[in-house]
Interface confidence: low
């Protein structure tokens, strides 16, 4: 049996993956749960199997198709519904019309690396993933430095108001260990947040010369 | 079978409002996006904007001001209502579906309703 | 808005020949729909998705295109295709319409 109020949240990678998150804050006891996806004009459906990640919700992903291909459109309206199993029939538990572009989460940055270190500053690239071709160059990322002592939380943000897919950090301390992240966030949709933060790039600043300040 | 059928056409009065109704029968509208297209005699066809199958609503931006598309779940019904209506608005109304698993565009259309615009 | 332009604007032809159809977006367009539409008739779907034939159309017609130029064929006119014919596209809203291409026998 379910109580209580739920909380049905999705997004659009952009090109063939929806990824969902349902809250719910009665008890669910052994009930298969699952998101369906039925799309207002193509010739597709899609069904993903809910899976617990915390006491009251549950995740999961549905894979439209080839991570690269464009499964959707700014026009597509895809009916979301979380159903799980009563008995022999199946109940609907919540309902959305989702809108895909005005729900984009891309996937986080990858392929970072340092393209050029010096003892104070540091150029590193990054690519994106699995990122639609209707965003052109409509896309911004926001960044951030991890310095010794500090927390990710401490460290500023440093903002890239276009798709700019490299960055160079100044004022670093010679000879010393950081750490970089990036995300990336579309320029449309009401909705449509940051991506997951990048993997970590660990890098390292040249120690000054010897009685030189470089 | 799919069937949409509008009703409500007819004369109406410059700066009057408009109301129609389109029933659809052999399937849900809490499946199915029904959207209304017009057509002004002798020109083509225009579309106005979609109810979708959750009940949110994409409008013509030309039509957002004095355009409102609602249904009621119920009765498996879809209403269109405009306002502040002029000699322009004189047209046939067409409800209208996008196909399911076998194909989309405009598969299934309703037989329109004439609404006529004079003093 | 996309526009989408039709041409010609009318054609006449003979029972059996081969009618084109051409229609032109205004910017690149990713799904064009064809329909029919007889006298006094709601429109019919032909075409969707730029070249796959609906449910009981007949194999005459067909369609084929890419980015901003669409083409719709009738390999050989019959006289029940005596009607006027729309491009569509479902790319961006607002969605929108040719004007349309009158076929008439001569």
């Known amino acids: 049996a379910v109580n209580g109020t739920s909380q049905f949240t999705c997004f659009y990678n952009s090109r063939a993956n929806i990824s969902c998150v349902w809250s719910q804050d009665g008890a669910l006891q052994d009930t298969s749960c699952q998101v369906h996806a039925w799309p207002d004009r193509r010739r597709w459906n899609q069904t993903c199997e809910l899976l617990p990640v915390s006491q009251a919700s549950w995740a999961c992903n549905l894979i439209l198709g080839a991570p690269d291909s464009q499964k959707l459109t700014t026009v597509d309206i895809v009916t979301l519904r979380v159903l799980c199993r009563e008995g022999v029939r199946w109940r609907v538990m919540a309902i959305q019309d989702f809108k895909p572009f005005e729900n984009l989460r891309l996937m986080a940055p990858i392929s970072l690396q340092v393209v050029h270190v010096e003892t104070h500053r540091c150029n590193i690239s990054w690519e994106i993933s699995q990122a639609s071709h209707y965003f052109e160059r409509h896309l911004e990322f926001e960044a951030r430095t991890l310095s010794p002592g500090h927390t990710w939380e401490e460290a500023p943000l440093l903002t890239l108001k276009q798709k700019q897919e490299w960055i160079c950090l100044e004022t670093l301390t010679p000879d010393t260990q950081y750490e970089f992240q990036v995300r990336v966030k579309p320029l449309q949709g009401e909705f449509t947040t940051w991506s997951p933060w990048s993997q970590p790039l660990a890098f390292r600043t040249k120690p000054a010369a010897l009685g030189k300040d470089t | 079978e799919v069937q949409l059928l509008e009703s409500g056409g007819g004369l109406v009065q410059p700066g009057g409002s408009l109301r129609l109704s389109c029933a659809a029968s052999?399937?849900?509208?809490?499946?199915?996006?029904v959207h209304w297209i017009r057509q002004a005699p002798g020109k083509g066809l225009e579309w106005l904007g979609v109810i979708w199958s959750g009940g949110s609503t994409d409008y013509n931006a030309a039509f957002i001001s004095r355009l409102t598309i609602s249904k009621d779940n119920s009765k498996n019904t879809v209403y269109f209502q405009m306002n502040s209506l002029r000699a322009e608005d004189t047209a046939v109304y067409y409800c209208?579906?996008?196909?399911?698993?076998?194909?989309?565009?405009?598969?299934?259309w309703g037989q329109g309703t004439l609404v006529t615009v004079s003093s | 808005d996309i526009q989408m332009t039709q041409s010609p604007s009318s054609l006449s032809a003979s029972v059996g020949d081969r009618v084109t159809i051409t229609c032109q977006a205004s910017q690149s367009v990713s799904f064009l729909y064809w329909y029919q539409q007889r006298p006094g008739k709601a429109p019919r779907l032909l075409i969707y998705?730029?070249?796959n034939l609906a449910s009981g159309v007949p194999s005459r017609f067909s369609g084929s295109g890419s980015g901003t130029s669409y083409t719709f064929t009738i390999s050989s006119l019959q006289p029940e295709d005596i009607a006027t014919y729309y491009c569509?596209?479902?790319?961006?809203?607002?969605?929108?319409f040719g004007q349309g291409t009158k076929v008439e026998i001569k």
């Open positions: 209208a579906r996008a196909g399911d698993a076998n194909y989309d565009g405009f598969a299934y």
């Open positions: 569509q596209q479902w790319s961006t809203y607002p969605l929108t």
């Open positions: 998705d730029t070249s």
């Open positions: 052999g399937f849900s509208v809490t499946s199915y996006g």
